[in-house]
Amino acid sequence: DAEFRHDSGYEVHHQKLVFFAEDVGSNKGAIIGLMVGGVVIA
């Protein structure tokens, strides 16, 4: 039997990836981070 039409069974969540660099002071250089959906992961 052919399958009846249905959408895919999962929902795709679109998230924004934001790379940022922050100057933290004279002797400490910079922090480079990756923010995914509002959470810093690197």
């Epitope: 039997d1 052919a2 399958e3 009846f4 039409r5 249905h6 959408d7 895919s8 069974g9 999962y10 929902e11």
Partner: antibody
Amino acid sequence: QVTLKESGPALVKPTQTLTLTCTLSGFSLSTSGMGVGWIRQPPGKALEWLAHIWWDDDKSYNPSLKSRLTISKDTSKNQVVLTMTNMDPVDTATYYCARRQLGLRSIDAMDYWGQGTTVTVSS
Amino acid sequence: DVVMTQSPLSLPVTPGEPASISCRSSQSILHSNGNTYLEWYLQKPGQSPQLLIYKVSNRFSGVPDRFSGSGSGTDFTLKISRVEAEDVGVYYCFQSSRVPLTFGQGTKLEIK
């Protein structure tokens, strides 16, 4: 509110063609994911699925009746039409239309039904 | 075709008591998208069918929480925790995974 209403002849003769109309209100068949199907129920018997049409004109038929059925839509009138050729007394039944909508946030089940229209096939 | 077999076909129940209806499909109704499209409809006397449960276990809006659905693969169950007089009618299981879409033969629930 969402309503569906079936209309058509109460009596048809054997070998004739039946034309049924389902008029929709409270929602539009042109909405992405929207679909309408037809189901029938002979007196005192179980339900039988006949056909379904989607907003994009994709159609599905019950293979056992496919040669006799045509489902179509008139988006401007918000109507779905089912024709069944070569009617026979065994086609005597109440015919229902029902709504079904695809989508990850949709029920994806027949959530609204019409009240049904009774068709008798007799000479 | 996927044959849906319900049992029992007749179900007399005392108000306030639980009730259970079984529905078995002749083959798996797991769709390729990962969902199982098993639905339950109730047809009250003289009325059109109405949706109770979709995708095995999800209650439709407005359906009392005494109704619950469960199962997987080919074996499904509708349970009513405490039957009320307004629950009388014919209950149909229905699969919409494969064409043709098919109903069970119906279970008639009546009050003792």
